[in-house]
């Protein structure tokens, strides 16, 4: 009887341990405004907070500007990107803008980068208005393997809103791969 | 043997009970169009349905216009806000509008309110067009503690689309806090 | 004792089996650009990929242009729809456009269709700019029953961006119905 009980307890313990060790990974990364690249071309954003304010990470890694997957699974990925301009910042180079975000996945094993999601808008930010603002939201469900990296590219990075509630991206694991 | 069996059964029963009692909380709240505030500036929307049409709530509470967290955890929060104007409603005050949403968290213990997510756009709604429409979507993953409250603020509430498929917000728990 | 053990093992086995058989359903469907309807009116999009590139499906069915629910539950539904136009494609019929998406649910038992989510914007795509782009994102949490069908309707389908990272929709089950 004792052996049976030990066996049952062991099963529970294994389950509990595995559940604890492999707690569902997640990340919510917010823009680091002290290091936003200039210019209007498409650039990769590499400076994000992972441990202050709303930013947090668990069972994933943030390194070299990329969110690294540590655990195979299906993840919901999302990004919210805000752009803004006030006349006090000076004139824009052009009133016709492409404000875009691209969420990309890079595989180290097969060195290649692919866009998972994109969103945005062309905008006419006329000099007739003193303030302009625009936000993009994208989200989707993707299979990610350990070692794969998620990164964010935007056009017109100099127009990014630096607030933590404005410009962020994240992921959370929903289920294992069968 | 009977004692062992009872003990094992008890473990299962506890798990089942806990799982049932602490079923993952969620809410999907849709705008109550009979009580949309007037005005233009940033206002808190306090009238939402929680139990009709697509609206529903479980293991969370809706009170005084706020969605109250009953169970600690990491939640995915989202909001979809639609604005619209038809010329038959009369002229707008200005053709340049700020159409914005702010998803805020209030902690009762430390009486303070913080914006978790924001989105929107400045829009030029010209009098040359008889109909205008614009939707905002935001979403993100946040740690919420029991007793904390989620609320929605918008600019230009008089322009809100009152349909349940247009203006709503929600949350669902993804995982426990370690 | 052996009987007890078998009974306990059986419970575990049942749980594991059920967990495996009823693994959380999901789908991520990407636009099939070879079969996009023409015109500018509101149409249902029926051609989607479910098994190439980012597109995938598990424990749900894609048939006749609709995503069919096989397992009761609460699901997070999402859609990302991109519209674009380049002057090399010829002039638009009008510079004032309504770019919209509607995520609808159809119940076979009660033959009726209801919109769960909508989003979009009226746009002024002036001939003064050679390129125009706009993306919509919607998402929400809904109770879905086995046999119910999810479909996507858009205005101006001829303007859809055919990339898999641009125009897609999906769902994943979050929890059972109590």
């Amino acid at each position: 009887i004792r052996a049976e009980k030990a066996m049952v307890d062991g099963s529970w313990l294994d389950l509990a341990k595995r559940s604890k060790l492999e707690a569902q990974p997640f990340a919510h990364l917010t823009i680091n405004a002290t290091d936003i690249p200039s210019g209007s071309h498409k650039v990769s954003l590499s400076s994000w907070y992972h441990d202050r304010g709303w930013a947090k990470i668990s069972n994933m890694t943030f390194s070299n500007g990329k969110l690294i997957v540590n655990q195979d699974g299906f993840y919901y990925l999302y990004a919210n990107i805000c752009f803004r301009h006030h006349e006090t910042s000076g004139d824009l180079a052009t009133e016709y803008l492409q404000l875009m975000v691209y969420v990309t996945k890079t595989s180290i094993k097969i060195p290649s980068s692919h866009t998972l999601m994109k969103g945005g808008s062309t905008k006419y930010w006329s000099g007739n208005s003193e303030f302009h603002f625009y936000s993009i939201n994208v989200g989707g469900f993707f299979k990610l393997r350990s070692g794969e990296e998620i990164s964010i590219e935007v056009s017109n990075p100099s127009l990014l809103d630096p607030d933590q509630d404005a410009t962020y991206f994240g992921a959370f694991k929903v289920r294992d791969i069968d | 043997i009977r004692a062992e069996k009872a003990m094992v059964d008890g473990s299962w029963l506890d798990l089942a009970k806990r799982s049932k009692l602490e079923a993952q909380p969620f809410a999907h709240l849709t705008i109550n169009a009979t009580d949309i505030p007037s005005g233009s500036h940033k206002v808190s929307l306090s009238s939402w349905y929680h139990d009709r049409g697509w609206a529903k709530i479980s293991n969370m509470t809706f009170s005084n216009g706020k969605l109250i967290v009953n169970q600690d955890g990491f939640y995915y929060l989202y909001a979809n806000i639609c604005f619209r104007h038809h010329e038959t409603s009369g002229d707008l005050a200005t053709e340049y509008l700020q159409l914005m949403v702010y998803v805020t968290k209030t902690s009762i213990k430390i009486p303070s309110s913080h914006t978790l997510m924001k989105g929107g756009s400045t829009k030029y709604w010209s009098g040359n067009s008889e109909f205008h429409f614009y939707s905002i979507n935001v979403g993100g993953f946040f740690k919420l503690r029991s007793g904390e409250e989620i609320s929605i603020e918008v600019s230009n509430p008089s322009l809100l689309d009152p349909d349940q498929d247009a203006t709503y917000f929600g949350a669902f728990k993804v995982r426990d806090i370690d | 004792i052996r009987a007890e053990k078998a009974m306990v093992d059986g419970s575990w086995l049942d749980l594991a089996k059920r967990s495996k058989l009823e693994a959380q359903p999901f789908a991520h469907l990407t636009i099939n650009a070879t079969d996009i309807p023409s015109g500018s009116h509101k149409v249902s999009l029926s051609s989607w990929y479910h098994d190439r590139g980012w597109a995938k499906i598990s424990n749900m069915t894609f048939s006749n242009g609709k995503l069919i629910v096989n397992q009761d539950g609460f699901y997070y539904l999402y859609a990302n729809i991109c519209f674009r136009h380049h002057e090399t494609s010829g002039d638009l019929a009008t510079e004032y456009l309504q770019l919209m998406v509607y995520v609808t649910k159809t119940s076979i038992k009660i033959p009726s269709s209801h919109t769960l989510m909508k989003g979009g914007s009226t746009k002024y795509w002036s001939g003064n700019s050679e390129f125009h782009f706009y993306s919509i994102n919607v998402g929400g949490f809904f109770k879905l029953r086995s046999g119910e069908e999810i479909s996507i309707e858009v205005s101006n389908p001829s303007l859809l961006d055919p990339d898999q990272d641009a125009t897609y929709f999906g769902a994943f089950k979050v929890r059972d119905i109590d």
Epitope: S129 | S40, H41, G90, L92, A93, T94, E95, Y96, L97 | -
Partner: nanobody
């Protein structure tokens, strides 16, 4: 930036009339909501009247309803305030203002709705 310059102020007897003008430059005047405010000696600034971008809708403070008329000429980039049946209590510096962002004209009865302000023109009602 929008520059606003008021004119038309002066000394007038009780019961008399004045027409204030506000010339706008630097932006597309026609898209903005416009308003008139006034500040009497030793008092705070108070709302007088507002008009929407097209001129089709107006809003007045109770104290001037029926006596004052706000109007605009978008072709000339000019805002007007016709003041009739003037009273000593109307003595103040009158400011014109331009604002955008908000759909409801009632909101433009508050100072915070406006981004741009003129320097003001003095109206004195006295016998």
């Amino acid at each position: 930036e929008v520059q606003l310059v008021e004119s038309g102020g002066g000394l007038v007897q009780p019961g008399g009339s004045l027409r204030l003008s506000c010339a706008a430059s630097g932006r597309t005047f026609r898209s903005y909501a416009m308003g008139w405010f006034r500040q009497a000696p030793g008092k705070g600034r108070e709302f007088v009247a507002a008009i929407n971008y097209s001129g089709g809708s107006t809003n007045y403070a109770d104290s001037v309803k029926g006596r004052f008329t706000i109007s605009r000429d978008n072709a000339k980039n000019t805002l007007y305030l016709q003041m009739n049946s003037l009273e000593p209590e109307d003595t103040a510096v009158y400011y014109c203002a331009a604002g955008s962002g908000y759909a409801s004209l009632s909101y433009y009865s508050t100072e915070r709705a406006y981004t741009y302000w003129g320097q003001g023109t003095l109206v004195t009602v006295s016998s």
